[in-house]
């Protein structure tokens, strides 16, 4: 539709959204035997029910509870990898290190990864033209509330040593306004989580700075310590080599610092 006629500032619902969600659900449940019991039609109905006919600025975590219930999944609580502003590398890592999990390796995260969706108040229509932008329109939109809900639950489930991958190329390596900074950090359970270990991923080949000394990392350490969780930090100077060494840990070049 013409730009003026769009209700919201953000892009509209992803094309073929219902078909995509359903297809992803079927694929995921086929690949993961522990989720074979899941009825994907019911999952889609619950997903749809969370936002259809509701004003896309008045979505609540409660709206997503039926979906959360259907998507309940047990992942090894000591094998959780969080990430902030570096999704691709985090996903490449868990594709190799198969015993570790990002949120997008769970059913609900997998269903919604990279998708946008919203409805319209009082109609059963999906809005393919525009959806609310978190900054320009409203924060309680279907996509933001979904990720806040699943991220909170994912963080709450974590135990022992939790890892987080952070983007060392950004001005704020740790950003309090990111999902990690605003949701996950505050929902790690001190009685279960012993340590948060940050992996700061370097962007430049010749960048030998210790980014663990960055002021935003110190801010993260302070927040975590106040929550009675230990904090540790590692520089990943060569992300390409890092991934290579995860694939082939016996490689002779993998004994040196990466």
């Amino acid at each position: 539709v013409p730009r003026w006629r769009q209700q919201w500032s953000g892009p509209g619902t992803t094309k073929r959204f219902p078909e995509t969600v359903l297809a992803r659900c079927v694929k995921y449940t086929e690949i993961h035997p522990e989720m074979r019991h899941v009825d994907c039609q019911s999952v889609w109905d619950a997903f749809k029910g969370a936002f259809i006919s509701k004003h896309p600025c008045n979505i609540t975590e409660e709206d997503y509870q039926p979906l959360m219930k259907l998507g309940t999944q047990t992942v090894p609580c000591n094998k959780i990898l969080l990430w902030s502003r570096i999704k691709d590398l985090a996903h490449q890592f868990t594709q190799v290190q198969r015993d570790m999990f990002t949120l997008e390796d769970t059913l609900l995260g997998y269903l919604a990864d990279d998708l946008t969706w919203c409805g319209e108040f009082n109609t059963s229509k999906i809005n393919y033209q525009s959806c609310p932008d978190w900054r320009k329109d409203c924060s309680n939109n279907p996509v933001s509330v979904f990720w806040k809900t699943v991220s909170r639950r994912f963080a709450e489930a974590a135990c022992d040593v939790v890892h987080v991958m952070l983007n060392g190329s950004r001005s704020k390596i740790f950003d309090k306004n990111s999902t990690f900074g605003s949701v996950e950090v505050h929902n790690l359970q001190p009685e279960k989580v012993q340590t948060l270990e940050a992996w700061v991923i370097h962007g430049g080949r010749e960048d030998s700075r210790d980014l663990c000394q960055d002021p935003t990392i110190k801010e993260l350490e302070s927040i975590i310590s106040k929550r009675n969780i230990q904090f540790s930090c590692k520089n990943i100077y060569r992300p390409d080599k890092f991934l290579q060494c995860v694939k082939n840990p016996e490689d002779s070049s993998c004994t040196s610092e990466i």
Epitope: V1, P2, R5, E120
Partner: antibody, heavy 118, light 112 residues
């Protein structure tokens, strides 16, 4: 059949105010953007204002900006146009029209005449 | 603002004969979504306007198939294959790609 019925027109002096109403029926009013369009006597059509389905977005023609306010009450299935600081050139038949989803008008009311004269 | 220009301003047609009305816009009405936001309305004497054609060539429900719309970009045409007495009135083109929405000045159709 979709019905739109305007009311509230009449004669007013320059500088005066009027509030037009448009009662909608036979469709889900709260799902549609709505427009006001006017037509001066013997002249062509001029778009005046539009409001989104939930009232969150409103746009106006430059000729009425700051003087006219479009609003809606979805619980009453009614569209409004508050017209202040009226001028002689605002004399026209005012139509409310339903947006077709792309910015055009698929249904129109019968119109209400506003006359501004001293 | 986008300016919409009609030609001719008026025409007189014998019943059963064809009629053609042209509308030009001052800029392209083609949107990046592939749609062209051009409408045709007919205002019969003493009545409100009624939608005939939307998005250049789509007939609105209940509109007789003797009406057809064509064109692209900035040049558009409304054709009536066989004019009937009930077709008299003023025909307006309108664009909705950009605010303010703008109408052409109209073409008055009369029966000979």
């Amino acid at each position: 059949e979709v019905q739109l019925v305007e009311s509230g027109g009449g004669s007013v002096q320059p500088g005066g105010s009027l509030r037009l109403s448009c009662a909608a029926s036979e469709f889900t009013f709260s799902s549609y953007w709505m427009h006001w369009v006017r037509q001066a006597p013997g002249k062509g059509l001029e778009w005046v204002a539009v409001i989104s389905y939930d009232g969150a977005k409103k746009y106006y023609a430059d000729s009425v900006k700051g003087r006219f306010t479009i609003s809606r009450d979805n619980s009453k299935n009614t569209l409004y146009l508050q017209m202040n600081s009226l001028r002689a050139e605002d004399t026209a038949v005012y139509y409310c029209a339903r947006d077709d989803g792309s910015g055009g008008f698929d249904y129109w009311g019968q119109g209400t005449l506003v006359t501004v004269s001293s | 603002d986008i300016v919409m220009t009609h030609t001719p301003l008026s025409l007189s047609v014998t019943p059963g004969q064809p009629a053609s009305i042209s509308c030009k816009s001052s800029q392209s009405l083609l949107h990046s979504d592939g749609k062209t936001y051009l409408y045709w309305y007919l205002q019969k004497p003493g009545q409100p306007p009624q939608l005939l054609i939307y998005e250049v060539s789509n007939r609105f429900s209940g509109v007789p198939d003797r009406y057809s719309g064509s064109g692209s970009g900035t040049d558009f045409t409304l054709k009536i294959s066989r004019v009937e007495a009930e077709d008299v009135g003023v025909y307006y083109c309108m664009q909705s790609i950009q605010l303010p929405l703008t109408f052409g000045g109209g073409t008055k159709l009369e029966i000979k």
